[in-house]
């Protein structure tokens, strides 16, 4: 079953290569457990950046090697992606799945274009 997911159109990563954006979904049922996946689309290829699962009202659980962190509040998930470089600039899509209880719902946002600018190296001070 389809579900509406909203996310900002554009986000600029900070100088440390960290970008944050909110992913909001319209829950049609009583969601107990939600899975959030961040997908990166570049050159017509889609790759999974990270995925988390969480029970409503609890913290997001990412896998150990994840470059993402996040918090949830109601039907909003605040996602942060770390360690980004200029080459990681691209469209980051938020996919939300209501895993539990049935029925299963899934929604995909239109994507957030994240721009990453590598910081200029500091000039030698000698």
């Amino acid at each position: 079953k389809a579900m509406h997911v909203a996310q900002p159109a554009v986000v600029l990563a900070n100088s440390r290569g960290t970008a944050s954006f909110v992913c909001e979904y319209a829950s049609p049922g009583k969601a107990t457990e939600v899975r959030v996946t961040v997908l990166r689309q570049a050159d017509s290829q889609v790759t999974e950046v990270c995925a988390a699962t969480y029970m409503m009202g609890n913290e997001l659980t990412f896998l150990d090697d994840s470059i993402c962190t996040g918090t949830s509040s109601g039907n909003q998930v605040n996602l942060t992606i770390q360690g980004l470089r200029a080459m990681d600039t691209g469209l980051y899509i938020c996919k939300v799945e209501l895993m539990y209880p049935p029925p299963y719902y899934m929604g995909i946002g239109n994507g957030t274009q994240i721009y990453v600018i590598d910081p200029e190296p500091c000039p030698d001070s000698d």
Epitope: T32, E33, R35, A51, T53, Y54, M55, N58, T61, L63, D64, M99, Y100, P101, P102
Partner: antibody, heavy 118, light 107 residues
Framework: QVQLQQPGAELVRPGSSVKLSCKAS????????MHWVKQRPIQGLEWIGN????????HYNQNFKDKATLTVDKSSSTAYLQLSSLTSEDSAVYYC???????????WGQGTTLTVSS | DIQMTQTTSSLSASLGDRVTVSCRAS??????LNWYQQKPDGTVKLLIY???KLHSGVPSRFSGSGSGTDYFLAISNLEQEDIATYFC?????????FGGGTKLEIK
Amino acid sequence: QVQLQQPGAELVRPGSSVKLSCKASGYTFTSYWMHWVKQRPIQGLEWIGNIDPSDSETHYNQNFKDKATLTVDKSSSTAYLQLSSLTSEDSAVYYCARRYTSSSFDYWGQGTTLTVSS
Amino acid sequence: DIQMTQTTSSLSASLGDRVTVSCRASQDIRNYLNWYQQKPDGTVKLLIYFTSKLHSGVPSRFSGSGSGTDYFLAISNLEQEDIATYFCQQGNTLPYTFGGGTKLEIK
């Protein structure tokens, strides 16, 4: 601390019904789904079904939909598993377990050993 | 239904050893894999959830890994109290299903 208390054993006759109990304490009973699991030596662990104590919504494993009925009593924070038309195949240990994130079960009862025998 | 297979039904190891228990799903379960310990008296405890997350109170010598269809539970520095049967369980799709269990014994 979280506790799920189950009777140790039940002995019943073939063809009859039995209602197994699981009394929860140490947490808000209506905030977590309760699941039931059957264990037999050869078949291993089998998921029977689950119930949301807040509104009694249930989901069953198709293999148990004509065998098991799940209910709750919110006033006593107790979950129940009723098994009908009992046969020797129903002889097993039955566990109640609280649902946690990623559909894991973070706390289990001690299990009730059900023996169906004439 | 998703079939969960633990190919090794029993495993013998010495105290202090590192032991790995494996579990395979019949289809991708997207890291919704949980591990349980069942003691001889029937007591069941959650060890690991969502592939690698250690449940509160579980010793750090237990760890989980894997993805897709293949998952692993590792126990380092094996202790006497670890003698038990270990079950995997998938939480991706109803009905939830369990592996057949791996019984861990001391050499």
